[in-house]
């Protein structure tokens, strides 16, 4: 299996945005790579987003995706937006080298993303 590294913990910003780097130990230069972000919470795993990209090109997520990303060599910089406290969980980076063959698969240990909903601003009387 291909080794995938990602940070253990990330704290989302007050705007509900979290970014982390997913690095894979590529045996060479795959021309087509698929990156999937999975969320594990309460022993359930769900797919958050996925993108397939050609080496040297940008990652393209679906238009309605909450993820964006850029790639550089064997590193993918992922950003997840629109997070709320209930989205706190373990976000796992899965990397697949799709082409050329053979197929390689690597799954990271996950990044625990903590999301804290901002306190509502108190009404002020003037």
């Amino acid at each position: 299996a291909m080794h995938v590294a990602q940070p253990a913990v990330v704290l989302a910003s007050s705007r509900g945005i979290a970014s982390f780097v997913c690095e894979y130990a590529s045996p060479g230069k795959a021309t087509e790579v698929r990156v999937t972000v999975l969320r594990q919470a309460d022993s359930q795993v769900t797919e958050v987003c996925a993108a397939t990209y050609m080496m040297g090109n940008e990652l393209t997520f679906l238009d309605d995706s909450i993820c964006t990303g850029t790639s550089s060599g064997n590193q993918v910089n992922l950003t997840i937006q629109g997070l709320r406290a209930m989205d706190t969980g373990l976000y796992i980076c899965k990397v697949e080298l799709m082409y050329p063959p053979p197929y390689y698969l690597g799954i990271g240990n996950g990044t625990q993303i903590y999301v804290i909903d901002p306190e509502p601003c108190p009404d002020s009387d003037f």
Partner: antibody
């Protein structure tokens, strides 16, 4: 486990052609990866010569100009090196090796020594 | 072609010591660098790939580091079986190229 084994001439006369065979066991050369020839000169300098891909594609080191050809026999799971118009400068140990596309070499043959001399 | 320069042809060490073998690329190769160990009469064996990842079965006393143009293979707690020649290799750009090698010897 994947194993690669080189075989071929040990002595070639100048201006003649050298032909080497790499026999692969434990993995089909059409299933994936790139199948390379690398040589090591006396003094241990390594030079990558070229590859034949799982799909039959080739790429050669430009330094060898038009002297090199790498072919395969998929039925025997073998690939071959042919180097034309050899000189004493081609005296080396020749290795076959496997890599992922533009990747590091994970499996190597044990090498075969070739001497160019009249 | 990308030239991989291993400036030290020989390095002397003692068992138990730590030693660092360096390699410099003539242009940026990112992290696409591997290291091989070769003993007399044998083929090169992969130690490190993608700059810092150990190949399967390689002891953790071997570590790789660097990026861009400067790369290092560090062997800590050198053992007698580590006395060999070490080659760096760039696989960022074809034609793939190797360093000239650094031979590790006993003091």
């Amino acid at each position: 486990d994947v194993q690669l084994q080189e075989s071929g001439q040990g002595l070639v006369k100048p201006s003649q052609s050298l032909s080497l065979t790499c026999s692969v066991t434990g993995y089909s050369i059409t299933s994936g990866y790139y199948w390379n020839w690398i040589r090591q000169f006396p003094g241990n300098k390594l030079e990558w010569l070229g590859y034949i891909g799982y799909d039959g594609s080739n790429y050669y080191n430009p330094s060898l100009k038009n002297r090199i050809s790498i072919t395969r026999d998929t039925s025997k799971n073998q690939f071959f090196l042919k180097l034309n118009s050899v000189t004493s400068e081609d005296t080396a140990t020749y290795f076959c090796a496997r890599n992922y596309y533009s990747g590091y070499f994970d499996f190597w043959g044990q090498g075969t020594t070739l001497t160019v001399s009249s | 072609d990308i030239v991989m320069t291993q400036s030290q042809k020989f390095m002397s060490t003692s068992v138990g010591d730590s030693v660092s073998v360096t390699c410099k690329a003539s242009q940026n190769v990112g992290t696409y660098v591997a290291w091989y160990q070769q003993k007399p009469g044998q083929s090169p064996k992969p130690l490190i790939y993608s700059t810092s990842y150990r190949y399967s079965g390689v002891p953790d006393r071997f570590t790789g580091s660097g990026s861009g143009t400067d790369f290092t293979l560090t062997i800590s707690n050198v053992q007698s079986e580590d006395l060999a020649e070490y080659f760096c290799h760039q696989y960022d750009t074809y034609p793939l190229t190797f360093g000239a090698g650094t031979k590790l010897e006993l003091k």
